[in-house]
């Protein structure tokens, strides 16, 4: 039985579609393609005589159609008006013609979407972020990608407005990364350029290393004191030290050569992040013994944080 196959069935505007004829009869002498579901002279697109290989345009011919010897019809630069049914009439030598109808659907060419954001530098546990995928296109599916992966399932992620809007409630540092939106219809898809979400966080409670074990041991007089402070923060925190409450340098590492019992006391590392408006600190007690006990930091480490 004569059949028509559309390749592709769903066509993006501006692309081309090929209507393929299958199971053509042996005794064929010509073909006629019509726009619509029936044979109607006013809807004739093109006729073709096999013997002369001559194609004759009809009233529905637009200049974008090409008929081939195998009866296939190529339509280029399709528009949405081309959506619908197409009928092939095969003229046979016995004059008992065969007909078959096929169809395709033209979808609008999708624009490249873009993402707008109400806040690309949110503060952890404080701000919400809404990403909107634009423009709004009817009969289109909206998808979101985070760092190249589909959206994770999370109660803090909300899709709304037909999935055009992605809202991150109370952002976390792990939400940082690259966000893309994609719009799809049955014929095509288009993805936005990535937007980077930079989550501001911290500074977390700092740690001072080396962590000396056992914790109740003290430094030997004459040893070098080398304390390194670290706190997770974005942007990197500003570090500063105080010894017995007296401000010292603004470095991550505090180094004192050849300590003596005069260096006994509390050593505090302060970290601050202007972007989050948060500060934190940790205090360690250092004991320097005049003679032979094992080196270390004392037990009384405690920390403070401020918002």
């Amino acid at each position: 039985k004569l059949t028509i196959e559309s390749t592709p069935f769903n066509v993006a505007e501006g692309k081309e579609v090929l209507l393929l004829a299958h199971n053509l009869p042996q005794n064929r002498i010509g073909y006629s393609w019509y726009k619509g579901e029936r044979v109607d002279g006013n809807s004739l697109i093109v006729g073709y005589v096999i013997g002369t290989q001559q194609a004759t345009p009809g009233p529905a011919y637009s200049g974008r159609e090409t008929i081939y010897p195998n009866a296939s019809l190529l339509i280029q630069n399709v528009t949405q008006n081309d959506t619908g049914f197409y009928t092939l009439q095969v003229i046979k030598s016995d004059l008992v013609n065969e007909e078959a109808t096929g169809q395709f659907h033209v979808y609008p060419e999708l624009p490249k979407p873009s993402i707008s954001s109400n806040n690309s530098n949110p503060v952890e546990d404080k701000d919400a972020v809404a990403f909107t995928c634009e423009p709004e296109v009817q009969n289109t599916t909206y998808l979101w990608w985070v760092n190249g992966q589909s959206l994770p399932v999370s109660p803090r992620l909300q899709l709304s407005n037909g999935n055009m809007t992605l809202t991150l409630l109370s952002v976390k540092r792990n939400d940082a990364g690259s966000y893309e939106c994609e719009i799809q219809n049955p014929a095509s898809a288009n993805r936005s350029d990535p937007v980077t979400l930079n989550v501001l966080y911290g500074p977390d409670v700092p740690t001072i290393s080396p962590i000396i074990s056992p914790p109740d041991s003290s430094y030997l007089s004459g040893a070098n004191l080398n304390l390194s402070c670290h706190s997770a923060s974005n942007p990197s925190p500003q570090y500063s030290w105080r010894i017995n409450g007296i401000p010292q340098q603004h470095t991550q590492v505090l180094f004192i050569a050849k300590i003596t019992p005069n260096n006994n006391g509390t050593y505090a590392c302060f970290v601050s992040n202007l972007a989050t408006g948060r500060n934190n600190s940790i205090v360690k007690s250092i004991t320097v013994s005049a003679s032979g006990t094992s080196p270390g930091l004392s037990a009384g480490a405690h920390h403070h944080h401020h918002h």
């Epitope: 942007p235 990197s236 500003q238 340098q249 470095t251 991550q252 590492v253």
Partner: antibody
Framework: QVQLVQSGAEVKKPGASVKVSCKAS????????LHWVRQAPGQGLEWIGY????????SYAQKFQGRVTMTRDTSTSTVYMELSSLRSEDTAVYYC?????????????WGQGTLVTVSS | DIQMTQSPSSLSASVGDRVTITCRAS??????LAWYQQKPGKVPKLLIY???NLVEGVPSRFSGSGSGTDFTLTISSLQPEDVATYYC?????????FGQGTKVEIK
């Protein structure tokens, strides 16, 4: 007291290279990043890049990528800035400057500057 | 890169006047902003960091304020020794960028 002492003035021909040194003293050399900033005659300040003396890690302004190289010698507490393929618009006073602390701090101590003149 | 725009490019004021210089960043700097003073023929000197913190030894007539993208350096009572060019600079990550400078003169 903290001091940054730079090498003397240089006159170079277009296409040549210049290497300026900056010797640090009065503080722990490896604890503070050192930056290079230049100032063309009658113009403003332009950041070139920095080096972490502890690790040797460098970061350069895009404009100078491929032309600038910063190195350090921890044994002499000295950093170096080499600029190649010199052109007349590189004529400037080049300053080394210490970052006030680690991470997101400005520049608190500056060298006296080295005038580099590029002329044919 | 972040752009720093200073205004005015120059100003002339009388001794004792209150002088204000503004600096606008192209992106939010969260307060990571410094001010420098450069006297003629001299090396730049850090006055203020973190937009309002006065460096030790800097006279209290200098003060900084602002937030986000807009910052101000104020000299409450201009002195003859304040004749200089003043530069703002963001210090939130690299590349560091400076404003084009404001030249302050005495009338």
């Amino acid at each position: 007291q903290v001091q940054l002492v730079q090498s003397g003035a240089e006159v170079k021909k277009p296409g040549a290279s210049v290497k300026v040194s900056c010797k640090a003293s009065g503080y722990i050399f490896t604890s503070y990043y050192l930056h290079w900033v230049r100032q063309a005659p009658g113009q403003g300040l332009e950041w070139i890049g920095y080096i972490n003396p502890q690790t040797g890690y460098t970061s350069y302004a895009q404009k100078f990528q491929g032309r600038v190289t910063m190195t350090r010698d921890t044994s002499t507490s000295t950093v170096y800035m080499e600029l190649s393929s010199l052109r007349s618009e590189d004529t400037a006073v080049y300053y080394c400057a210490r970052e006030y602390g680690n991470y997101n701090y400005p520049l608190d101590y500056w060298g006296q500057g080295t005038l580099v003149t590029v002329s044919s | 890169d972040i752009q720093m725009t200073q205004s005015p490019s120059s100003l002339s004021a009388s001794v004792g006047d209150r002088v204000t210089i503004t600096c606008r960043a192209s992106e939010n700097q969260y307060g990571y902003l410094a001010w420098y003073q450069q006297k003629p023929g001299k090396v730049p000197k850090l006055l203020i960091y973190n937009y309002k913190n006065l460096v030790e030894g800097v006279p209290s007539r200098f003060s900084g304020s602002g937030s986000g993208t807009d910052f101000t350096l104020t000299i409450s009572s201009l002195q003859p020794e304040d004749v200089a060019t003043y530069y703002c600079q963001h210090h939130l990550g690299t590349p560091y960028t400076f404003g084009q400078g404001t030249k302050v003169e005495i009338k």
